[in-house]
Amino acid sequence: KSPVFGPQEVSSVEGNSVSIKCYYPPTSVNRHTRKYWCRKGASGRCITLVSSEGYVSSNYAGRANLTNFPENGTFVVNIAQLSRDDSGHYKCGLGINSRGLSFDVSLEVSQGPELPNGTEVYTVDVGRTVTIKCPFKTENAPKTKALYKKIGQTSVLVIDSRNYVNPNYKDRIRLRIPGTGQLIFTVVIDRLRLSDHGLYLCQAGDGSNRDEKNADLQVLEPEPELVYEDLRGSVTFHCALGLEVANVAKFLCRVNSRETCDVVINTLGKRDSAFEGRILLNPQDKDGSFSVVITGLRKEDEGRYLCGAHSDGQLQEGWPIQAWQLFVNEESTIPRSPTVVKGVAGGSVAVLCPYNPKESQSLKYWCLWEGAQNGRCPLLVESQGLVQEQYEGRLSLLQEPGNGTFTVILNQLTTQDAGFYWCLTNGDTRWRTTVEIKIIEGEPNLKVPGNVTAVLGETLNIPCHFPCKFSSYEKYWCKWSNTGCQTLPSQDEGPSEAFVNCDENSRLVSLTLNPVTRADEGWYWCGVKQGHFYGETAAVYVAVEEKKVAGSRYVSPAKADAAPDEKVLDSGVREIENKAIQDPRLFAEEKVVADTGDQAGGSRASVDSSSSEEQGGSSK
């Protein structure tokens, strides 16, 4: 007996769609072998109509597809625009059509229910609004107008022009009679329920001269849209519920095993803690549509999601909804990268951000997730070099190591830097990822002066002490600007007094500016790296003043002043907008930091092709 299983009988009506699921044992051979859907002919042969290798027969072109879900051991055949010619006997199977791994499926497509002549069909999703049009003749204009629902052989009054409203339709139905000259009345039913489904009769007048019109109302529960995303990636649910609910609170919820729907996020400020740091509800457009972005997808995020509108910010029967079935593919194209990066106060972190390697030219961004209200993510830095003002001198986005990964370095860490950050590009939105920065106890590994004042025209020597564990790393000094950090020549000066336990392995790398010019003012970073992977960094600010005393100046950590005060971000941070899905620059109004001079000028600055290290970068 074949191990393939599916529906034995599928019945539908003309114009409809079917979605036929076939199940197979998910062995490695079965998962990767050809899947097919074929029609059995009179000769007994089974002619392929669609297969997992991309084949689609001519009479299925544009209306059918086959999707394999290998980790679940299922494949799905979707067929749209059914006609009665599609009725017949089919097989869904694996491998070759003539071999045994298949299951017989009978498909029957009928004409649909016989409706009285002239019946108007209204097909509407549950929770939405329908307007039933009811024409009448002039002589019935002054007479009673009514709408009945046919239940079996009887007709039940739903509403009439004498102000009667059936209790089942209370507060959600209205009958509109137009001004003179218009020979049509309308009945509007809001917040449709599944129980509203059925045949209705409009009536104007009574006796043999009455006007009648039949209406067939089909109320559909929205079929969930299948959404298939990669583990660690991102999903966007676009929710368009119509203008009728434009001003009503919106929500996204996930259906649980008890069949209720747990709010994931809503516009009233509620958010499920399981999505902390990785969810945003984009403010709605004028038409009431909105979207929800979830990053850092986990296997446990799988399930059925509903978006909807209701004043309580949660699911209520009879209000409009949209549905999705989210699958999270464990065979992900998105590489593993740490979801938590730890740093110490005063230290630094180097965060690796994945992006779609096919989009190496895309703009790269890094933003700070803020949980207030619906969540927002103001941009902090982008690959074109724009940096939020308060991050001046301590944040840089580097294109390295490249080939699907960029690096973000943040130094001078404080406890206020703890939080969730998103890596994103202006390309493939599914590659958005989330990283949490945690500030832990400890001392920075690199030691530099806090603040240095250099004298114009003289020599400045800035030391950077590093411990023995970095002895095999490449050390560098660079001058920070809002477009990156340009490497400068530096020299290794041998043992350092700063780390007494490490003897000759504890070393010092120094930056010498000779002679100091006005252009030298600004932020300098001392750092370590291995190839294109960056490790820790330490920042020092150099101020330049007029000559007061002759002679060169050597700064030791004992003479270092406190770092300059951070500039505070002004208020103009905009919340993420729908457009930001296409253009993440709209996550925030960027504050552009003025470029700080000519990268230390002349022959004294050698430009390295920037570079990156493992996630983290704190004293262990």
Epitope: F5, P7, Q8, E9, V10, S11, S12, V13, N16, S17, V18, S19, I20, K21, Y23, F69, E71, N72, G73, T74, V76, G112, R193, L194, S195, Q218, L220, E221, E223, P224, L226, V255, S257, R258, E259, E302, G303, R304, E317, A323, Q325, F327
Partner: nanobody
Framework: EVQLVESGGGLVQTGGSLRLSCAAS????????MGWFRQAPGKEREFVAA??????????YVGGSVQGRFTISRDAAGNTVYLQMNSVKPEDTAVYYC?????????????????????WGKGTQVTVSS
């Protein structure tokens, strides 16, 4: 909460027929799928048949051991499901349980797996005598 109530069980002769019914109540909306499982003494619960619907489209699933003998159907309102049992055999003797599902779940959900059904009836005994 959804309540499922089975009826129609009883004693039937080999080769005879029986029709089981299962009525769902307690919710204002219809279930998405309903099915039948059976359990003979000392054995695991076994899939018999299931019916799933979406608008005017219906999908019927039948377990291998009853194929060609048992059929599943439902009433127009979608709240009652029937199992027509023809050509019954002594090995069909078991407690027959009705199951229902309100939520169209993930693509991996297999109607044959009892764990994937949310609601269950208390069962009705079917005994086939030889």
């Amino acid at each position: 909460e959804v309540q499922l109530v089975e009826s129609g069980g009883g004693l039937v002769q080999t080769g005879g027929s029986l029709r089981l019914s299962c009525a769902a109540s307690g919710r204002t909306f219809s279930p998405y799928a309903m099915g039948w499982f059976r359990q003979a003494p000392g054995k695991e619960r076994e899939f018999v048949a299931a019916i799933r619907w979406s608008g005017a489209t219906t999908y019927k699933y039948v377990g291998g051991s009853v194929q060609g003998r048992f059929t599943i159907s439902r009433d127009a309102a979608g709240n009652t499901v029937y199992l027509q049992m023809n050509s019954v055999k002594p090995e069909d003797t078991a407690v027959y349980y009705c199951a229902a599902d309100r939520v169209p779940k993930d693509i991996s959900i297999d109607p044959r797996n009892p764990k994937d059904w949310d609601y269950w009836g208390k069962g009705t005994q079917v005994t086939v005598s030889s």
